[in-house]
Every structure is written in C-alpha cells, then in structure tokens.
C-alpha cells in the first residue's frame, strides 16, 4: 500500500513536479499580464507606482547564474504569499472602480492560492524546509483615497508580473540542473 493518507509522497521525478509548477506560474503570469493591461486601459497610470509593503524583487539577470533550488522556492513562496495578501486586501478595500474588476481579481487570487499550494507540495516532495516569512505580515492599512487604491492596484499587479516573470525563468533554469 502507498504512504499513509496526508503524508507527502516522495516524487519519483522532481523535474515533472517542477514542470507542473512552471506551467502554473506561466498561466498566472498570463492572467496577471492581462489584468494589468485591463487596469491600464480602464484606469491609466501616470508613471510607475510602488507600494512600500510589497516585497522587493528577489531575482535579476545578474543573480540567475547563482540560483539554488531551496532558496528560489522559499523566496518565491514567501513573496507570492505577500502578493496573495495584497490582492485579498485590494478586493476588500476597493471602492466601486475596482469592484468592476472583482471577477478577475477573485480569479487571480484563487490561482495564486493554487500556485502557493503547488509550491508547498513541491517543497515537501523535495524535503525542503517550509520556511516561514522573515518577519510577521504587517497589516495593510486603508488606501488614502480611491485614487490611492487604483495606484496600489497598479503597483501590486506590476510587481506580481515581474515576480512571476523571473520565477518562470528561474524555475526553468533550475530544472536543467536537477
């Protein structure tokens, strides 16, 4: 009989698990890109927007060569958890403008959750430690205004897009080293 219910089975092929994570990440990247474009269409952004509570981008062209699987998966999961909280916050704190994007934001949140579960599973199959975030999650305060929440939405979607873009590259590179 197989392993007891609820215990992670050790994957015979971690590359297949990684493939599946890459597929989910790519799919989420496409959704994010589409929603970010919708945002720009509906609520044109005047320049770049940032949000102090968002994680800083973990990867860059210079760091790609030195990536290690445990570090990438851990950091990616921590960052995506932060983006998950931000999307959840956006949906709850939004005024009527963003409520018009509620179905898309809801779907994005659900897919983010699915990717987080997949990464968690991948980490347990690879027997990697389930690292907790460095610091406890800071409660997100209310946007200063409706315009503030629109700017926040631009920042969240833009940051998530960049994070997922680098995640796909990083995961694909790591797959070649497995």
């Amino acid at each position: 009989p197989g392993p007891p219910a609820g215990s992670p089975r050790v994957s015979s092929d971690p590359r297949a698990d990684l493939d599946s994570a890459v597929l989910l990440t790519r799919s989420l990247l496409a959704d994010t890109r589409q929603l970010a474009a919708q945002m720009r269409d509906k609520f044109p952004a005047d320049g770049d927007h940032n949000l102090d509570s968002l994680p800083t981008l973990a990867m860059s062209a210079g760091t790609l060569g030195s990536l290690q699987l445990p570090g990438v998966l851990t950091r990616l999961r921590v960052d995506l958890m932060s983006y998950f909280r931000h999307v959840q916050w956006l949906r709850r704190a939004a005024g009527p403008s963003l409520k018009t994007l509620e179905p898309e934001l809801g779907a994005l949140q659900a897919r983010l959750e699915r990717l987080l579960r997949r990464l968690q599973l991948l980490m347990s199959r690879l027997a990697l430690p389930q690292a907790a975030p460095d610091q406890p999650a800071v409660p997100l305060g209310p946007p200063a205004s409706a315009w503030g929440s629109i700017r926040a939405a631009h920042a969240i979607l833009g940051g998530l897009h960049l994070t997922l873009d680098w995640a796909v590259r990083g995961l694909l590179l790591l797959k070649t080293r497995l």
Epitope: K42, F43, R91, R92, A93, A94, G95, P96, S97, K99, T100, E102, G141, P142, P143, A144, S145, A146, W147, G148, S149, I150
Partner: antibody
C-alpha cells in the same frame, strides 16, 4: 478641514423631480469615491448610490435604480443626485459621504426631502 | 428588512461593557470589511470602526470591533452617558453591488 454641505432638499409632490447637490471642500475631491445615503424619519440608514472618483463607475440601490442618477463635477468639487419619479417612500434626510475605499470617513449634515401631495 | 441583522436595542449602566452584534452572509461580511457608525440624536452618522477593527483618530479605545466569519461585533467598555446613540454596522455586498447596513441598535445608558 474636510467639509461636505448638502443642498436642494425641500417639499415635492409625488412623481416630480428634485436635484440634490453636495459641495465638497478641504480635500482633493477628484481622488475620492462619493456616496449618497438616506434616512427616513425615525428609521435606519439606507445606502442610495455611489460614484467613482472619476465618475466612470456608478452603482445604485435597487430601490432607486432607473429613477435616481448620481453624478459629479470635479471641476466644481460638487456631487449631485438627480431624483425623478419621486415617491412618498423617498422621504428622508439625504447625506453625502466621502469614502477612501470601503468606509465613509466624512458625512455631510444632510438635507431633508419630503415627498407629499 | 435589512441585509445585516442587528439587535434593535441594547442597554447598560455606566462603567459596564456592552456588545452589539451584526450578522450577515458570505457576500458581505464574509468577504468585505465591516464598518461601524455612531449616530447621536439629531446629528449625522460618524465613523466609529473601520476595516473590521480599526479606530479613526479621536475615537476612544473604549470602542473596539471584531469579526469572525459572517458576523461582526462592536464592544463598548466603560460605558458613559454620552455613548447613548444609534449604532449601525455596514459592509459592501458583492452580490448586490452596493453598501448594506444593519437596521441599527439603539443603545441606552441606564441610571
């Protein structure tokens, strides 16, 4: 400081129209979504309508849909509520309220609308 | 009939702690922030609690909000005579695409 002042209330016959105004000052009006909330005499609060900061998105309560229109003029820092086909049950104090997102942080003092023949 | 359900009245003596409940559903309280407003007789409502449990500046820490699932509550400790007012809970409702209020709770401070 933030100020919201409603005007335009009064006594009107059923079936007639009325336009309420809300003059805003003390903040950047064009950055905030705005709502109308009403309160019938001796009753609770009832949400009426909301308009987004730019005026492009509007939502209405079922009880006023098709009869009331919310609008704004950001150049004049003014919010409006055009009320047509008024009914006796529309009699209430009408408040305008500012929202940064999901809550009303500032309210006007209200203007009374009485629909009576 | 209000979408959010509150008890019509509540009472307490000075110094006591009172709690006002607000019950909703997954489309309002369950998925959006809850806000509480205080309306003193003859005046406009005033924001008391927002984002489920945050207090605007100027609101005493005797007032606190909490939420669990599809219900929320407002607690007032160290009750004072000036707390006598109507209290309303409110939230956005995703199904109705609008703001919903509770029917209001009239708080009486006895003695």
């Amino acid at each position: 400081q933030v100020q919201l002042v409603e005007s335009g209330g009064g006594v009107v016959q059923p079936g007639r129209s009325l336009r309420l105004s809300c003059a805003a000052s003390g903040f950047t009006f064009s950055h905030y979504d705005m709502h109308w909330v009403r309160q019938a005499p001796g009753k609770g609060l009832e949400w009426v309508a909301v308009i987004s900061y730019s005026g492009s998105v509007k939502f209405y309560a079922d009880s006023v849909k098709g009869r009331f229109t919310i609008s704004r003029d950001n150049s004049k820092n003014t919010l409006y509520l055009q009320m047509n086909s008024l009914r006796a049950e529309d009699t209430a104090v009408y408040y305008c309220a500012r929202t940064p997102g999901s809550h009303f942080d500032y309210w006007g003092q209200g203007t009374l609308v009485t629909v009576s023949s | 009939q209000s979408v959010l359900t509150q008890p019509p009245s509540a009472s307490g003596t000075p110094g006591q702690r009172v709690t006002i409940s607000c019950s909703g559903s997954s489309s309002n309280i369950g998925s959006n922030y809850v806000n509480w407003y205080q309306q003193l007789p003859g005046t406009a409502p005033k924001l008391l609690i927002y984002y489920d449990d945050l207090r605007p500046s100027g609101v005493p820490d005797r007032f606190s909000g909490s939420k669990s699932g599809t219900s929320a509550s407002l607690a007032i400790s160290g009750l004072r005579s000036e707390d006598e007012a109507d209290y309303y809970c409110s939230a956005w409702d995703d199904s109705l695409s609008g703001v919903v209020f509770g029917g209001g709770t009239k708080l009486t401070v006895l003695g």
